[in-house]
C-alpha cells in the first residue's frame, strides 16, 4: 500500500441472518467515523452461522482467515438445540490465536481458557447469575439456602461461583443438592430438600430439567407459601416457563439477546483495541487462511491482551468491560416475577446491586410479605461438653436407660440420652456410644423444649472441646474447633453447655442472654495445718541430734573410767566403813542420759573428783541443749503453717512464673483465649501454654494430685467442685468476669426466644432453684480453724 | 373485545361521599390484571387512585388513601370505588382502566366520567 | 413518590415534522414507563410500554427510547391525527405517576 494509504485491518463475524451482516457493516462504517483514523480503516467480512461444525470451521478458515482477520465476532446460532455452534468458530480461530468475540453465547464452558484459549464475550455466562442471586440473598435476608444444580459443566461452574461468594461472607449452603442433567425423576432429591430448614431454593438447570423439577416441587407442595425460588434466564424460558411455579424470581439478561446491539458493542471494542494495538511496535499480520499454515498469529495473544483490558463506556448495552477470563463484567439484570403465568420486572441488578421494587413482587402461595426464607425445623440438634455440675456424664444401664437418682431436693434426677465418645482420655480409641446426661444445663434445656414446643437430640462434642479459631495446617485460614465448630458447620442447631460468652465467639455466633453470671477463679489444694510425728526432731538439725546422742554416751564412758581409775576416786574416814563402788558403766549412762533429759537423779552419781567436775560440765552443757531446744521447738510449733494460698490474679507466683509453681487452664477454651489475648498476661500465657490440660476433669485431678499447683477456670464450675472435694478450695477475688450462654448460630430463628426464655426464667426463680439444685449445695465443711494437729503422716 | 364502562353520580355534594362503578365486558375480572381507578381535574394531569388485583388484593395513592375503598363484585364483573368526604378538588373526569402488569402499562380504558363536586 | 417532569410543556410544530419529547423521572425507572395520547373529551390511549416497545396498532412512527431516569418519544413523521396531548407514566414504585403533559398543536 501507499505510504499515505490507510491500514486495512479486517474484522470478521459469524452472524444469525443476513440483517445481522448488515447491521455489522453499518456498525464498522459507524467505528470508522467514530476515530476518524487516516492511518487504520476497518473492514467487514461477514458470514451467517452453518449447519454444523465442520461446514462451519471451514467458512471460518476460507471466508474469514484468508482475509487476514484481527478478530472474529460470533453470535449464539438461532436454533436452541444447536447449543455448541461458536465451537467451531472459538476452536479454529484459537488455534491461530485470532481473538474471537461472542455476542450472545452463555454458556459457562466458554470461560475454560484451556479450552477457549482466545475466547472473550460481551455477556457473561450463565453461573454469574450466581453474582445476582447472592446480592438478592443479602438484600433480603435470606441466610437459609438449597442449591439445586444440575451435575454438569453449567451447574458446577454456578456452584462453585456461589458458594465461593458464600464463603466470603463466612456462610454456605445448608445444602446442595445435584441431579444428573436429563433425569426424569427428582423427587427423592426434592424430599430430601423438603426435609431441610431452609425455603431458599436456587435452581441452576436446562430448560428441560427445570421443568421436571418444578412439576416435581409442585407435587411436593414445595411451591407453596413460605417457599422462594430463586432462578436464572433459562429457568424461565420456553419449556421450563410452562411449568414454573407462580411466584418464582429469575432473571433475565438485559439485552441478552439483542444481537444487533450486542454487534455494536462488540465492533466498538474491537475498534479501539485495533487502534491501541497498531500504536505498539513489532505487530504481525494475522496469518491468511488455514491451508499448510500451523503457524499461531504471533500478535494474536497480545491483542487479546489489549481486548480484555478494554473499557468501552458508552456501549449500547451499558460499560463494557471483561473479566481475567474474558466474559463480561457488570452485566445488567432485570429480576422478573412470574404472576398468574405472566413475567413482570420487579427488580434490577445494575452489575453491582439489586434494587427491588418489593410493591409488585408476589410470592409464592400469592403471598405479598417476604418470606422468612427458612422453616422452624422443631428437632434440633443440641451439642454439648462433659462439665460437673453443668453437665454430668454417666453410662447407660445395660438395658440403654438411664439409672434413676435423685437430686439433694429429693426430687428425681431429669436424665437424657446423649450421644458422644465413651473416653476422652488421648490415645484410647474412641466409640460413638449412647450415654446419660444430666445436671444444670438438661435441666436447662428440658425447660427451654418444654417452652418453646421443640424436640431435641443431645450429642457430646467428639473433639471434647469448648472452641478456639486454630489455624488450618499452618495456613492463614481459621477454623473453630469444639462446639463452636459444630455449631458452625451445621453439625448441631445449639450449644447448650457452661459456653462462655465473649466478643471472639460472639462475632460468629449468636449467644443468648446469660443463664449463669460468674467469672474465672483459682482452684488450689487445701492445705490443713498439721505437724507430723517427727515434727519435734525440727528444732535440731540431724548432725546437732548427732552429736548430742555421740556426747550422752562419750560422756557416760568418760565418767566410768574417771570414776574407775581416778586415785582421788575413794578415801576412808575410817577404815571400818564399806568403801562405795565405782560408777558402772550402765549406771554412768543412766546418769548421761538423766542430767540431759532433765530427771532428777537420787543415786548412781560419779564419786571420783574428775568424774564430777565432766558430770558438773556435762550438766552445764545439757542444760543450754534443752533450753534451745524447748525454745526451738515453740517456734517450730507456732511456725509450722502451710506456705500463704493464692491470693488471686496478681499473686506474685503466678506473675512471675516458674517451674517450681505451675498453674494452667483448659486448651482452646475461652479461658485459654483470655490469657492469649490479654497482652499484660502474656508472660502468664506463656507458662499456662506449656501445662495446659484437655480437660476441666482432667486439671482438676492433677490439682489433687499435687501435679498442678493452680487451676484457673470458671467460678461456678470449681466453687461446686471444691464444695464436692474436700481437699480443694478455690481462693482469690473473681476476674474476668462473664457468663455461661446458650449457643446458636446468626441466623438461627430461635434466638430471640431463647433469651426471652432465660430472662423469664431469671424473674421466676427457675435459675435460682437450678443452682441450689446443681451449684451451690455443699457436701464440705468450709471452716478451716482448727489447730495445728500432730498426725502420723 | 375487553370494554370498560365507568357509571355513577355525575353530582355529589361536599363532604359527602363519591361512589362510582366499572363494569368490565369481555373479559373476567378474577382472572388476570389489575384494574385501576384514574382521575384527571378539568385541564389538568392524570392522577393515579388505587387498583384491585384480579386475586382481590388491592393498593391505594398514599394521597387519598384514608378516603378512598376500592372493591369488586365478581358475580356482575364489576370494581368499584368509594372516595369519602369529597370536597370541589374531587371534581374531575374518573376513568377505569385495565393494567398488563406483565408490560407495566394501561391497555384498556374507559371512556371516563365526569364528576363535579357541589352544592 | 417519583416526580416525572415532561417538556416541552406544549410545542407547534407542522406536518411532517420530526418531533421529540422528552420525561425525566426524579429517580432511576430503569425502564419501566409508558407513554400515552389523549385527544380532547377522550381517555388516553398507550402508545408505547417498557420505554421502548410500541403497543399493538400503534404506527411505527412512534418509537420511544431511553433508560434510567431519561426517557424519549419521537415521531418521526407528524400527521395530522397526532396533534394531541402525550403523558409519560412510570410504573417503577407505588404511586406509579404521571408526566404534567406535552400539547402538541399545529403551528
Known amino acids: 500500500r501507499a505510504a499515505c494509504d490507510p491500514k486495512i485491518v479486517n474484522i470478521g463475524a459469524v452472524l444469525s441472518t443476513r440483517k445481522h451482516e448488515q447491521m455489522f457493516r453499518e456498525a464498522v462504517n459507524q467505528a470508522n467515523k467514530r476515530h476518524g483514523s487516516w492511518k487504520i480503516q476497518l473492514n467487514a467480512t461477514s458470514v451467517t452461522h452453518k449447519p454444523n461444525a465442520i461446514q462451519m470451521a471451514l467458512s471460518v478458515c476460507e471466508d474469514l482467515i484468508s482475509s487476514q482477520v484481527y478478530a472474529i465476532l460470533v453470535s449464539h446460532p438461532p436454533t436452541p438445540n444447536d447449543h455448541f455452534t461458536p465451537t467451531p468458530v472459538s476452536y479454529t480461530a484459537g488455534f491461530y490465536r485470532i481473538p474471537v468475540l461472542g455476542l450472545t453465547t452463555r454458556m459457562s464452558i466458554y470461560s475454560d481458557k484451556s479450552i477457549h484459549l482466545s475466547f472473550l464475550r460481551t455477556v457473561p455466562p450463565y453461573s454469574h447469575q450466581s453474582s445476582v442471586w447472592f446480592e438478592m440473598m443479602r438484600v433480603y435476608s435470606w441466610n437459609h439456602i438449597i442449591l439445586l444444580v444440575s451435575d454438569d459443566h453449567e451447574g458446577r461452574a454456578a456452584q462453585k461461583r456461589l458458594e465461593t461468594l458464600l464463603e466470603e461472607r463466612e456462610s454456605k449452603a445448608e445444602k446442595v443438592l445435584q441431579f444428573d442433567p436429563g433425569t426424569k425423576n427428582v423427587t427423592a432429591l426434592l424430599m430430601e430438600a423438603k426435609e431441610l430448614e431452609a425455603r431458599v431454593i436456587i435452581l441452576s438447570a436446562s430448560e428441560d430439567d427445570a421443568a421436571t423439577v418444578y412439576r416435581a416441587a409442585a407435587m411436593l407442595n414445595m411451591t407453596g407459601s413460605g417457599y422462594v425460588w430463586l432462578v436464572g434466564e433459562r429457568e424461565i424460558s420456553g419449556n421450563a416457563l410452562r411449568y414454573a411455579p407462580d411466584g418464582i424470581l429469575g432473571l433475565q439478561l438485559i439485552n441478552g439477546k439483542n444481537e444487533s446491539a450486542h454487534i455494536s458493542d462488540a465492533v466498538g471494542v474491537v475498534a479501539q483495541a485495533v487502534h491501541e494495538l497498531l500504536e505498539k511496535e513489532n505487530i504481525t499480520d494475522p496469518p491468511r487462511g488455514c491451508v499448510g499454515n500451523t503457524n499461531i498469529w504471533k500478535t494474536g495473544p497480545l491483542f487479546k491482551r489489549v481486548l480484555m483490558s478494554s473499557k468501552y463506556a458508552d456501549g449500547v448495552t451499558g460499560r463494557v468491560e471483561f473479566n481475567e477470563d474474558g466474559d463480561r463484567k457488570f452485566a445488567n439484570y432485570s429480576i422478573m416475577n412470574l404472576q398468574n403465568r405472566k413475567l413482570v420486572q420487579v427488580g434490577i441488578y445494575n452489575g453491582t446491586h439489586v434494587i427491588p421494587n418489593d410493591r409488585k413482587i408476589i410470592w409464592p402461595g400469592g403471598e405479598t410479605e417476604k418470606p422468612r426464607g427458612y422453616q422452624m425445623s422443631t428437632r434440633l440438634k443440641i451439642v454439648t461438653i462433659h462439665q460437673e455440675p453443668f453437665v454430668y456424664v454417666k453410662p447407660t444401664l445395660s438395658d440403654g436407660t438411664c439409672k434413676e437418682e435423685f437430686t439433694v431436693n429429693g426430687d428425681p434426677v431429669k436424665k437424657v440420652i446423649c450421644t458422644g465418645p465413651n473416653d476422652t482420655s488421648p490415645g484410647s480409641p474412641r466409640h460413638t456410644v449412647p450415654q446419660c446426661c444430666y445436671g444444670f444445663c438438661i435441666d436447662l434445656l428440658i425447660k427451654l423444649a418444654r417452652t418453646m414446643n421443640f424436640t431435641y437430640e443431645v450429642h457430646l462434642v467428639a473433639d471434647g472441646k469448648f472452641g478456639t479459631q486454630e489455624r488450618v495446617n499452618n495456613s492463614n485460614k481459621k477454623e473453630w474447633n469444639g462446639m463452636m465448630g459444630e455449631l458452625l458447620s451445621g453439625q448441631a442447631d445449639m450449644i447448650v453447655a457452661p459456653l462462655t460468652i465473649n466478643n471472639e465467639r460472639a462475632q460468629y455466633i449468636e449467644f443468648s442472654k446469660p443463664f449463669k453470671y460468674q467469672g474465672l477463679t483459682i482452684l488450689v489444694k487445701k492445705e490443713i495445718p498439721r505437724s507430723t510425728l517427727d515434727s519435734f526432731m525440727q528444732p535440731f538439725q540431724s548432725t546437732l541430734w548427732l552429736l548430742v546422742g555421740l556426747s550422752v554416751h562419750v560422756v557416760a564412758v568418760m565418767l566410768y573410767l574417771l570414776d574407775r581409775f581416778s586415785p582421788f576416786g575413794r578415801f576412808k574416814v575410817n577404815s571400818e566403813e564399806e568403801e562405795e563402788d565405782a560408777l558402772t558403766l550402765s549406771s554412768a549412762m543412766w546418769f548421761s542420759w538423766g542430767v540431759l533429759l532433765n530427771s532428777g537423779i537420787g543415786e548412781g552419781a560419779p564419786r571420783s573428783f574428775s568424774a564430777r567436775i565432766l558430770g558438773m560440765v556435762w550438766a552445764g552443757f545439757a542444760m543450754i541443749i534443752v533450753a534451745s531446744y524447748t525454745a526451738n521447738l515453740a517456734a517450730f510449733l507456732v511456725l509450722d503453717r502451710p506456705e500463704e494460698r493464692i491470693t488471686g490474679i496478681n499473686d506474685p507466683r503466678l506473675r512471675n512464673p516458674s517451674d517450681k509453681f505451675i498453674y494452667a487452664t483448659v486448651k482452646q477454651s475461652s479461658v485459654d483465649i483470655y490469657f492469649r489475648r490479654q497482652v499484660e498476661l502474656s508472660t502468664m500465657y506463656r507458662h499456662m501454654e506449656k501445662h495446659n490440660y484437655e480437660s476441666a476433669a482432667e486439671a482438676i485431678q492433677a490439682v489433687r494430685d499435687n501435679k498442678l499447683h493452680a487451676f484457673i477456670w470458671d467460678s461456678a464450675v470449681l466453687e461446686f467442685e471444691a464444695s464436692q472435694k474436700c481437699d480443694l478450695v478455690t481462693t482469690g477475688e473473681l476476674f474476668f468476669r462473664s457468663g455461661f450462654g446458650i449457643g446458636m448460630r446468626k441466623d438461627s430463628p430461635w434466638k430471640q426466644n431463647v433469651s426471652l426464655s432465660i430472662l423469664k426464667s431469671h424473674e421466676n426463680g427457675f435459675m435460682e432453684d437450678l443452682d441450689k439444685t446443681w451449684v451451690r449445695y455443699q457436701e464440705c465443711d468450709s471452716r478451716s480453724n482448727a489447730p495445728a494437729t500432730l498426725t502420723f503422716e | 373485545q375487553v370494554q370498560l364502562q365507568e357509571s355513577g353520580p355525575g353530582l355529589v355534594k361536599p363532604s359527602e361521599t363519591l361512589s362510582l362503578t366499572c363494569s368490565v365486558t369481555?373479559?373476567?375480572?378474577?382472572?388476570?390484571?389489575?384494574w385501576h381507578w384514574i382521575r384527571q381535574p378539568p385541564g389538568k394531569g392524570l392522577e393515579w387512585i388505587a387498583y384491585?388485583?384480579?386475586?382481590?388484593?388491592?393498593d391505594y395513592n398514599p394521597s387519598l388513601k384514608n378516603r378512598v375503598t376500592i372493591s369488586r363484585d365478581t358475580s356482575k364483573n364489576q370494581f368499584s370505588l368509594k372516595l369519602s368526604s369529597v370536597t370541589a378538588a374531587d371534581t374531575a373526569v374518573y376513568y377505569c382502566?385495565?393494567?398488563?402488569?406483565?408490560?407495566?402499562?394501561?391497555?384498556?380504558w374507559g371512556q371516563g366520567t365526569l364528576v363535579t363536586v357541589s352544592s | 413518590d417519583i416526580q416525572m417532569t415532561q417538556s416541552p410543556s406544549s410545542l407547534s410544530a407542522s406536518v411532517g415534522d420530526r418531533v421529540t419529547i422528552t420525561c425525566r423521572a426524579s429517580?432511576?425507572?430503569?425502564?419501566?414507563l409508558a407513554w400515552y395520547q389523549q385527544k380532547p373529551g377522550k381517555a388516553p390511549k398507550l402508545l408505547v410500554y417498557?420505554?421502548?416497545n410500541l403497543a399493538d396498532g400503534v404506527p411505527s412512527r412512534f418509537s420511544g427510547s431511553g433508560s434510567g431516569t431519561d426517557y424519549t418519544l419521537t415521531i418521526s413523521s407528524l400527521q395530522p391525527e397526532d396533534f394531541a396531548t402525550y403523558y409519560c407514566?412510570?410504573?417503577?414504585?407505588?404511586?406509579?405517576?404521571f408526566g404534567q403533559g406535552t400539547k402538541v398543536e399545529i403551528k
Open positions: 429517580e432511576n425507572i430503569y425502564s419501566n
Open positions: 384491585i388485583r384480579y386475586d382481590g388484593r388491592n
Open positions: 417498557a420505554a421502548t
Open positions: 382502566a385495565r393494567e398488563d402488569y406483565g408490560s407495566s402499562s394501561f391497555d384498556y
Open positions: 407514566q412510570h410504573f417503577w414504585d407505588s404511586p406509579p405517576t
Open positions: 369481555g373479559y373476567s375480572i378474577t382472572s388476570d390484571y389489575y
